[in-house]
Amino acid sequence: QEEDLPRPSISAEPGTVIPLGSHVTFVCRGPVGVQTFRLERESRSTYNDTEDVSQASPSESEARFRIDSVSEGNAGPYRCIYYKPPKWSEQSDYLELLVKETSGGPDSPDTEPGSSAGPTQRPSDNSHNEHAPASQGLKAEHLYHHHHHH
């Protein structure tokens, strides 16, 4: 049997509930040796690739996907996969992004604390952080429709 690739994890900075027009960065993490990270929205067919991979720790690499100004169309579930030659990994669990209207209230927090979804976490019922199953994501200029992985 082939050697299994560890599942990637996904997190969002500064969190998973983002005010309209603010920025969010998805962070995908995997093992060292990753050539390409892919951020998928909902399914295989809508994604963005990057080869801008950095080493997060001696055993982990990461890539960051930033949306400068989120719109309502960016809301939904996202997941990561990676390519470590010669194979694509499984997908991470989904991370659900919520986009909220800015209320302007001084007591209302702008974001939820940084949230993540990874292989060791159980699926969550939390409506803005679906750790174990789900998907949807970035705007046209950020995430593109494709028919195949590569």
Partner: antibody
Framework: QSVKESGGDLVKPGASLTLACTAS?????????MCWVRQAPGKGLEWIGC???????IYYASWAKGRFTISKTSSTMVTLQMSSLTAADTATYFC??????????????WGPGTLVTISS | ELDLTQTPASVSEAVGGTVTIKCQAS??????LAWYQQKPGQRPKLLIY???SLASGVSSRFRGSRSGTEYTLTITDLECDDAATYYC?????????????FGGGTELEIK
């Protein structure tokens, strides 16, 4: 895009049998969950397990571990090896692939099934 | 191990009526829930994925919803062609828990 099962047969209790699922029109390298599901006559669907066609990760139903083995044998074929078969394993065995365009891994593509009969 | 309890096991309803089928998960599975329709001698057909999203080509008379760990398939304005067995399935595959399980099925008869 399609998947098709083969290898169904009439075999005696205690025997072993290997079923094959042949894929066409898509690439295993893209990383699909290829799953095996069975259905005894007049009964419901029963999940056996899945293999991720690129990474090689395999997941089994707890009852299937040990007697059932899922493997990727080529770039277009996945197999299900079954051992120590009993009459309770008599069923139509389906191969299914998760979706290309939908999230949350639903089985979108199903084969027609292959019948396995265990009888002396 | 994950268990999906599907109710009712069978239901009979008249043409034009509405049927509700429930699937209760023994643990949290988020939106990893699909619904299938199967007619005798045929392979299953995907109806709903991600708990509430309609698969392409499926009539909008089929609707999926979720409340916590309870999932519901509602079929409105029933037609004779809806007579079939319906199954829910957890579509999460991973080490967190054993997914993949199907509910026991609901046989729908159209009167």
């Amino acid at each position: 895009q399609s998947v098709k099962e083969s290898g169904g047969d009439l075999v005696k209790p205690g025997a072993s049998l290997t079923l094959a699922c042949t894929a066409s029109g898509f690439s295993f390298s893209d990383g699909y969950y290829m799953c095996w599901v069975r259905q005894a006559p007049g009964k419901g669907l029963e999940w056996i397990g899945c293999i991720h066609s690129s990474s090689g990760s395999i997941y089994y139903a707890s009852w299937a571990k040990g007697r059932f083995t899922i493997s990727k044998t080529s770039s277009t074929m996945v197999t299900l090896q079954m051992s120590s078969l009993t009459a309770a394993d008599t069923a139509t065995y389906f191969c299914a692939r998760d979706s290309e365009s939908y999230g949350y891994n639903p089985c979108e593509l199903w084969g027609p099934g292959t019948l396995v009969t265990i009888s002396s | 191990e994950l268990d999906l309890t599907q109710t009712p096991a069978s239901v009979s309803e008249a043409v034009g009526g509405t049927v509700t089928i429930k699937c209760q998960a023994s643990q949290t599975i988020s939106n990893y829930l699909a619904w299938y329709q199967q007619k005798p001698g045929q392979r299953p057909k995907l109806l709903i994925y991600a708990a509430s999203s309609l698969a392409s080509g499926v009539s909008s008379r089929f609707r999926g919803s979720r409340s916590g760990t309870e999932y519901t398939l509602t079929i409105t304005d029933l037609e004779c062609d809806d007579a079939a067995t319906y199954y829910c399935q957890c579509t999460y595959y991973g080490t967190t828990y054993v997914g993949g399980a199907f509910g026991g099925g609901t046989e729908l008869e159209i009167k």
